[in-house]
């Protein structure tokens, strides 16, 4: 097909385009100190940065969005940087019956793309 | 758990928050006129609008992102409005051997959320 391919080199300069970044957060930051017991400090990988034309396009829809944003910037937003996959996180937390270990699959980003 | 629940009422006023919107686009707009034969006009549903705190949060990660954006707006971006699901679209297009009908699963958004 004649679909444009997503590109991986950032035209805006190093660190400006959509990428994974680690943010330190305490349970207090998250408002979780009343139910999560461990870990007390979380390494939260998040997706940050801009999505210039066709950079790391998630799919065909994102490529269309990029194209139409170029034509109608007031009507169609640029694609934005969101998680493409997640890393499971184990939390030790309170339950009604005591304490439990539970794995959360949608808490920390592992990869990013432009959608 | 003490996770905040995503909310569905828009605090910014009607039509301002993340929602599905139909955008008309021609094959020329998309740069597809050399390979797509039909349809010649596409009704492209796209996700547009803002993502205020906890509005239509995609998952726990998005809730965390919203929280940390409130605390560190320069470091953590707000969640943004992206497709949560897609509607399949059938395109009639040229191939090396003639003409083909093909279904594209990731072309038109069906639902939106804040990720």
């Amino acid at each position: 097909s004649a679909h444009a391919h997503p590109r991986d080199s950032c035209p805006l300069g190093p660190g400006r385009c959509c990428h994974l970044e680690t943010v330190q957060a305490t349970l207090e930051d998250l408002g979780w100190s009343d139910w999560v017991l461990s870990p007390r400090q979380l390494q939260l990988s998040m997706c940050v940065g801009e999505c210039p034309h066709l950079y790391r396009s998630a799919n065909t829809h994102a490529q269309i969005k990029a194209r139409l944003h170029g034509l109608q910037p007031d009507k169609v937003p640029a694609p934005c940087c969101v998680p493409s996959s997640y890393t499971p996180v184990v939390l030790m937390h309170r339950t009604d019956s005591g304490v439990s270990l539970q794995t959360y699959d949608d808490l920390v980003a592992r990869g990013c793309h432009c959608a | 758990s003490a996770h905040a629940h995503p909310r569905d009422s828009c605090p910014l006023g009607p039509g301002r928050c993340c929602h599905l919107e139909t955008v008309q686009a021609t094959l020329e707009d998309l740069g597809w006129s050399d390979w797509v034969l039909s349809p010649r006009q596409l009704q492209l549903s796209m996700c547009v609008g803002e993502c205020p705190h906890l509005y239509r949060s995609a998952n726990t990660h998005a809730q965390i992102k919203a929280r940390l954006h409130g605390l560190q707006p320069d470091k953590v971006p707000a969640p943004c409005c992206v497709p949560s699901s897609y509607t399949p679209v059938v395109l009639m297009h040229r191939t090396d051997s003639g003409v083909s009908l093909q279904t594209y699963d990731d072309l038109v958004a069906r639902g939106c959320h804040c990720a």
């Epitope: 390494q43 996180v89 184990v90 030790m92 304490v99 | -």
Partner: antibody
Framework: QVQLQESGPGLVKPSQTLSLTCTVS??????????WTWIRQHPGKGLEWIGA???????YYNPSLESRVTISVDTSKNQFSLKLSSVTAADTAVYYC???????????WGQGTLVTVSS | DIVMTQSPLSLPVTPGEPASISCRSS???????????LDWYLQKPGQSPQLLIY???NRASGVPDRFSGSGSGTDFTLKISRVEAEDVGVYYC?????????FGGGTKVEIK
């Protein structure tokens, strides 16, 4: 069921670097909240926490060993490693790798490997 | 670093009888969330340590209910309601409130 297995030389010369690897099977090393940990036990003595590494690559070391310790992770091999430089006879110990929830709740341990520092 | 002190050093026990091990910390292990950040481990002869109790009083998965942990602040106790022959080994308490986690010197439990 998560299993951990230490590997590396059992004999290291004084002033050299002790290098051990822990291979994790039955689970991914790339999990948040999990700290992959090294603990040692001197012959006939108690346990000493050496340090740990989180999935993100963040490391935490015992201040008493910090200047000599490096812990790293290789997610592609599901392994994490310990390097202890400038060893002396006092570093002779059984070295264990373990999985912790942060720096507590060490629920899975390797079988331990004895490292002797001697010329 | 937090210093952990265990007593007794050695504990001869009779199968079927209860047993108790004490652990004292040099500073309070009680977190503002109301939990005590203390683990108990058992190292059986020739084996790696195994987790028994975490957060002061929570039994780890698969640990028999004859083991219980109690105490708060700086004074903690591990109790075995009815000792079995397989319970012999060295018991360690461990402070997990802050880095670095520190272990007690151990209590050796042996059959009389």
């Amino acid at each position: 069921q998560v299993q951990l297995q230490e590997s590396g030389p059992g004999l290291v010369k004084p002033s050299q670097t002790l290098s051990l690897t822990c291979t994790v099977s039955g689970g991914s090393i790339s999990s948040g909240g999990i700290y992959w940990t090294w603990i040692r036990q001197h012959p006939g003595k108690g346990l000493e926490w050496i340090g740990a590494i989180a999935y993100s690559g963040s490391t935490y070391y015992n201040p008493s060993l910090e200047s000599r310790v490096t812990i790293s992770v290789d997610t592609s091999k599901n392994q994490f490693s310990l390097k202890l430089s400038s060893v002396t006879a006092a570093d002779t110990a059984v070295y264990y790798c373990a999985r912790g929830i942060e720096y507590q709740h060490f629920d899975y341990w390797g079988q331990g490997t004895l490292v002797t520092v001697s010329s | 670093d937090i210093v952990m002190t265990q007593s007794p050093l050695s504990l001869p026990v009779t199968p079927g009888e209860p047993a108790s091990i004490s652990c004292r910390s040099s500073q309070s292990l009680l977190h503002s969330n109301g939990y005590n950040y203390l683990d108990w481990y058992l190292q059986k002869p020739g084996q790696s340590p195994q987790l028994l109790i975490y957060l002061g009083s929570n039994r780890a998965s698969g640990v028999p209910d004859r083991f219980s942990g109690s105490g708060s602040g700086t004074d903690f106790t591990l109790k075995i309601s009815r000792v079995e022959a397989e319970d012999v080994g060295v018991y360690y308490c461990m402070s997990t409130l802050e880095l670095p986690p520190t272990f007690g010197g151990g209590t050796k439990v042996e059959i009389k």
